[in-house]
């Protein structure tokens, strides 16, 4: 069998192949040892005793989408059956007190691999043998540990593969120089180690995206706005926009960054070297964000000028094909290429309530029955959008231990300006946060407030 | 360039079987899956199910399972689709689509199924 | 299977005009998200892949967007070229599934 034929996924175009795609990888052309790997198909009844207690769950992820050129990093991790765990040794242990279907195991190891290679005969001293080998015939590589290694990982996309020795979790990168651009399958096979043999444990599959286009995301943020995620923003206050650009593998690190924004308030087009900006719609209605960011990235060279045209006609080669990496002519030239990045959002703006101030506070005298408690009067004000709702937090004088929340809804004249009561037990220092609220605002004020002892004589203080 | 290029518009019995084929070029046929789509008159488009060229590796909708049958055959790059035990609601166009998600897309062939 | 919910069905509007087209999946899908265009007798062409990223040669005024369960199809300004029906796919899982389509009409 050839590698093809026991990864069921993409194969390369002979292009591919001669130049090498994915750096450290190989052609699944390759032959692949069956009698060592055995292959067996979805549905297989054998998959259901390829691990004791249960089956072996595989989880790939990758930081997909990668922009072509940058390296993209698979994981992938097993998850054991319950009660199981990878010791420090690299056996299969069960977790001691826990107790999953079949009870307490008597026995402490699922698989102990380590009393397996002890026993293992066959070798040459440098631990080489004719098992210890991938399903493509190299043999493991003798790092450190290696012996606590017993996962075998075949990772096949593009029709070539690369297998790892590892633990329960491991890590590929791959360079997306030459990756064809739009989702691609990376498809992960998982082999344990069975005597002087190898049995799958799992098999699993993931997306990954390759673009050409810078991968952004903005995020936005406004005082007193209710909902960040709703894309409705208050006229006249500041949005802080925040651009993340999604490149965990640093291929941007040494490029210069420009971000070319325009809000659709026709403010005109604002270009920056930073990736937040702050913007205040001054209009009401409807506008259109539109966000450019512009990278020179590391690229692949222009081809060189056509030679000469001879006199003779020559004989056409045929099309090219479709792949990218054809434009790359000398690998060791240092070439730059301008990538782009889009976000365009529909942004709303409506009236908020824009500011809210406590300009008077009353101590309300009450009749002699109630002597441990205070009412005092809030006299607020607000600018901006007519407040439906107010909140009042009361709580200790570090403002972070709630005592009390009081929510009530208000009926408040186009002034703006109302008066809240409320009751304190007790003297002492209190935090006040009050809360003026609409359908799309929030905004808050927040004062401490020394209530005396009940001697009519003491008067309110504000503390701060 | 890329090309897929269908075979021609079949008219067929309910009961028979359709065989539309698909032939690529302009790229390495097995580097990528193949998509067959198919599309009933004035409707939406239904996924049939892909093949891997390389080593007829072949995911079905599972509605189509029983009866469509996709092919590749690498010497002339070419894959198939074959519908078999057809009935009035067949009649579509069935469009072989290149990759995970289609880039590119054949032109169509009709199949008229009709008694 | 993973439903593809696409509205508006049909929509009229004017050259120039902004458009958008909004495809809600039964399930999480990820970004795993493509956009087609389908002119009458003629093949799907190919817009967006990954929820928001362009095919090489489909003009910027097309955008998408979306993550999760909600995606759309953004035209900013329409040209008449655009008038056609436009579906989304889902490719997350099997079997991949296309919403209804829309129809974007001349008004």
């Known amino acids: 069998k050839r590698f093809h034929d026991v990864l069921g996924n993409e194969r390369p175009s002979a292009y591919m192949r001669e130049h090498n795609q994915l750096n450290g990888w190989s052609s699944d052309e390759n032959d692949w040892n069956e009698k060592l790997y055995p292959v067996w198909k979805r549905g297989d009844m054998r998959w259901k005793n390829s691990w004791k207690g249960g089956r072996v769950q595989a989880v790939l992820t990758s930081d997909s989408p990668a922009l072509v050129g940058s390296n993209i990093t698979f994981a992938v991790n097993l998850i054991f059956p319950r009660c199981q765990k990878e010791d420090a040794n690299g056996n299969i242990v069960y977790e001691k007190n826990c107790r999953n279907e079949a009870g307490l195991s008597a026995d402490p190891y699922v698989y102990n691999w380590t009393a397996w290679s002890e026993d293992s005969d066959g070798e040459n001293g440098t631990g080489q043998s004719h098992h210890n080998v991938f399903p493509d015939g190299k043999p493991f590589p003798h790092h450190p540990g290696w012996r606590r290694w017993n996962f075998i990982y075949v990772f096949h996309t593009l029709g070539q593969y690369f297998q790892k020795l590892g633990r329960c979790s491991v890590r590929v990168s791959v360079n997306t120089a030459n990756v064809t651009l739009g989702p691609q399958l990376m498809e992960v096979t998982v082999y344990r180690r069975h005597g002087r043999a190898y049995v799958p444990i799992a098999q699993v599959k993931d997306v990954y995206v390759v673009t050409d286009q810078i991968p952004v995301f903005v995020t936005m943020f406004q005082k007193n706005d209710r909902n960040s995620s709703d894309e409705t923003f208050l006229k006249d206050l500041p949005i802080m926009f925040d651009v993340l650009i999604h490149d965990p593998s640093h291929f941007l690190n040494y490029s210069t960054i420009n971000y070319k924004w325009s809000f659709g308030d026709n403010t005109g087009l604002f270009v920056s070297t930073n990736h937040t900006v702050n913007h205040t719609y001054v209009l009401n209605g409807t506008f259109s964000l539109n966000l450019t960011v512009k990278a020179a990235a590391p690229g692949p060279c222009p081809p060189p000028p056509p030679p000469p045209r001879p006199s003779k006609p020559t004989p056409s080669l045929g099309p090219a094909g479709d792949n990218p990496l054809e434009l790359s002519r000398i690998p060791d030239e240092n070439c730059q290429i301008n990538r782009y990045g889009h976000f365009q959002a529909t942004i709303t703006i409506v009236e908020g309530i824009l500011e809210v101030n406590i300009i008077q506070m009353t101590d309300v005298l009450m009749p002699v029955p109630w002597p441990e408690s205070s009412l005092i009067d809030f006299v607020v004000t607000c600018q901006g959008s007519i407040p439906t709702e107010v909140c009042t937090i009361i709580s200790d004088p570090t403002c972070e231990i709630t005592q009390n929340t009081v929510c009530s809804p208000v009926d408040v004249d186009e002034m703006c300006l109302l008066t809240v009561r409320r009751t304190f037990n007790g003297s002492g220092t209190y935090c006040v946060n009050l809360t003026l609220g609409d359908d799309t605002s929030l905004a808050l004020t927040s004062t401490l407030i020394s209530v005396p002892d009940r001697d009519p004589a003491s008067p309110l203080r504000m503390a701060n | 360039q890329v090309q897929l290029v269908q075979s021609g518009a079949e008219v067929k019995k309910p009961g028979a079987s359709v065989k539309v084929s698909c032939k690529a070029s302009?790229?390495?046929?097995?580097?990528?899956?193949m998509n067959w789509v198919r599309q009933a008159p004035g409707q939406g488009l239904e996924w049939i199910g892909a093949?891997?060229?390389?080593?007829?590796?072949?995911e079905y909708n599972q509605k189509f399972k029983d009866r469509a049958t996709m092919t590749a055959d690498t010497s002339t790059s070419t894959v198939y689709m074959e519908l078999s035990s057809l009935r009035s609601e067949d009649t579509a166009v069935y469009y072989c689509g290149r990759s995970y998600s289609p880039d590119y897309w054949g032109q169509g062939t009709t199949v008229t199924v009709s008694s | 299977d993973i439903q593809m919910t696409q509205s508006p069905s049909s929509l009229s509007a004017s050259v120039g005009d902004r458009v958008t087209i909004t495809c809600k999946a039964s399930q999480n899908v990820d970004n795993h998200v493509a956009w087609f265009q389908q002119k009458p007798g003629k093949a799907p062409k190919a817009l967006i892949y990954?929820?928001?990223y362009r095919y090489s040669g489909v003009p910027d005024r097309f955008s998408g967007s979306g993550s999760g369960t909600d995606f759309t199809l953004t035209i900013s300004s329409l040209q008449p070229e655009d008038f056609a029906t436009y579906f989304c796919q889902q490719y997350k899982s099997y079997p991949f599934t296309f919403g209804g389509g829309t129809k974007l009409e001349i008004k």
């Open positions: 990954s929820a928001s």
């Open positions: 302009g790229y390495t046929f097995t580097t990528y899956w």
């Open positions: 093949i891997n060229p390389s080593n007829d590796y072949t």
